[in-house]
């Protein structure tokens, strides 16, 4: 039942990361006018990944397109392959998440293989949260980079007669979209891998395990408890194994095959 | 086409309040903020202010807060002014202006302020 | 405040006189974000509302004949009528589109000769 809430909740976690990384790949608030040296701006600038806006004193919002692939930052262009990488392997993740859910009976798909789905998707969501946490933290600092320099030359003018203000940029709403989406998915991943070795079925081999009765001395309660008058001359009761059987509790604490998490 | 029809002209004592409104029609407006000038004779235009129909947001010429009051009626396609506490100095033509660029002027209300 | 300074205040020409006219601004209304420049031009007639003539400094409005040009960057900025008509004769205005509050300035009369 943990296993199954486990791999619920990090199924529902990076799924809500991942509609946040496509939400903040897609908005256009990467980088906003920083508005401390001209609070009344009446033309407001704004940047995402894919187009700038301006919007203008009568409300109306100008957005461009960035229509050229050459021309553009080499760090803009990294940050696009971060998130869009970031992007596919969340979308893959999820696939492969709907069929390793505990819930979701396919055909007769045994544990082994859900629990095996279930790691892979939960790597996918970790570098998937990853991809974006690392796209919009490298955005993030070309921004600091870039408001320290147009600081550093803020006004020119003629004799310091006329000021001309160079527009400086600040963070904007998808860059904490981004961080707060790539940590869900994070999370989500690392939730997965966690319910990954739950569902890991035990790999032991069970032998036969034989009951003798010897004479009237042994009688079987109901339980599965067997009692017997004997126990000292009770020599032929051996039942015979190679491991033991243990509690759920116990096989967590044995190592397995998918425990390279 | 866009147009804005501005109410009629008004004669107000000193210390009354006036309310002024500007239909707008041939485009949706919420689309466009409302602006609102004025140009007293012989001064040059002045902007008090605009509101943003959508929301109801405003801001206002420093010249002007606690002077001017902006409202809009949204259902009504109309743009509401008030202006309180009339003085002599107030007299002049007050024009309501929108869309891109703001290209488009009410033909303006003319408020005569005389006691 | 941005203060737009507009000079001459009035002008006397012709029929078919070349005229311009020039606006200063104390802070360039220059944005960066998509290279334009937030100045308008704006021609008005006794008695009625402004009317728009050029906007972004240099692209004229829809309708406005090809004789109205408009130039200059950052501050200093001209409205040209490369052959003026009977029907230009009137008041042109430039206002700042970059800053609140929006500011205009005094104006250039046209007036005829």
């Known amino acids: 039942m943990a296993v199954t809430a486990c791999q619920g909740l990090g199924f529902v976690v990076s799924l809500i990361g991942i509609a946040g990384i496509i939400a903040a790949t897609c908005m256009d608030q990467w980088s906003t006018q920083d508005l401390y040296n001209n609070p009344v701006t009446a033309v407001f600038n704004y940047q995402g990944l894919w187009r700038s806006c301006v919007r203008e004193s009568s409300g109306f919002t100008e957005c461009r397109g960035y229509f050229t692939l050459l021309g553009l930052p080499a760090m803009l262009q990294a940050v696009r392959a971060l998130m869009i990488v970031g992007i596919v392997l969340g979308a893959i993740g999820l696939l492969v998440s709907i069929f390793a859910l505990k819930c979701i009976r396919i055909g007769s798909m045994e544990d082994s293989a859900k629990a095996n789905m279930t790691l892979t998707s939960g790597i996918m969501f970790i570098v998937s949260g990853l991809c974006a946490i690392a796209g919009v933290s490298v955005f993030a600092n070309m921004l600091v980079t870039n408001f320290w320099m147009s600081t550093a030359n803020m006004y020119t003018g003629m004799g310091g007669m006329v000021q001309t203000v160079q527009t400086r940029y600040t963070f904007g709403a998808a860059l904490f979209v981004g961080w707060v989406a790539g940590g869900l998915t994070l999370i989500g991943g690392v939730m997965m891998c966690i319910a990954c070795r739950g569902l890991a079925p035990e790999e032991t081999n069970y032998k036969a395990v034989s009951y003798h009765a010897s004479g009237h001395s042994v009688a079987y309660k109901p339980g599965g408890f067997k009692a017997s008058t004997g126990f000292g001359s009770n020599t032929k009761n051996k039942k015979i194994y190679d491991g033991g059987a243990r509690t759920e509790d116990e096989v967590q604490s044995y190592p397995s095959k998918h425990d390279y998490v | 086409q866009v147009q804005l029809v501005q109410s009629g002209a008004e004669v107000k004592k000193p210390g009354a309040s006036v309310k002024m409104s500007c239909k707008a029609s041939?485009?949706?407006?919420?689309?466009?903020?409302m602006h609102w000038v004025r140009q007293a004779p012989g001064q040059r235009l002045e902007w008090i202010g605009y509101i943003n129909p959508n929301n109801g947001g405003t801001s206002y010429n420093q010249k002007f807060k606690g002077k001017a009051t902006l409202t809009v009626d949204t259902s009504a396609s109309t743009a509401y002014m008030e202006l309180s506490s009339l003085r002599s100095e107030d007299t002049a033509v007050y024009y309501c202006?929108?869309?891109?660029?703001?290209?488009?002027w009410g033909q303006g209300t003319t408020v005569t302020v005389s006691s | 405040d941005i203060v737009m300074t507009q000079s001459p205040s009035s002008l006397s020409v012709s029929v078919g006189d070349r005229v311009t006219m020039t606006c200063k601004s104390s802070?360039?209304?220059?944005?960066?974000?998509?290279?334009?420049?937030?100045l308008t031009w704006y021609q008005q007639k006794p008695g009625k509302a402004p009317k728009l003539l050029i906007y972004w400094a240099s692209t004229r409005e829809s309708g406005v004949p090809d004789r109205f040009s408009g130039s200059g960057s950052g501050t200093d900025f001209t409205l040209t009528i490369s052959s003026v008509q009977p029907e230009d004769f009137a008041t042109y205005f430039c206002q700042n589109d970059y800053s609140y509050p929006l500011t205009f300035g005094g104006g250039t009369k046209l007036e005829i000769k």
């Open positions: 202006v929108t869309t891109r660029y703001l290209a488009v």
């Open positions: 041939g485009y949706t407006f919420t689309d466009y903020n």
């Open positions: 802070q360039s209304l220059f944005n960066s974000g998509n290279q334009k420049n937030y």
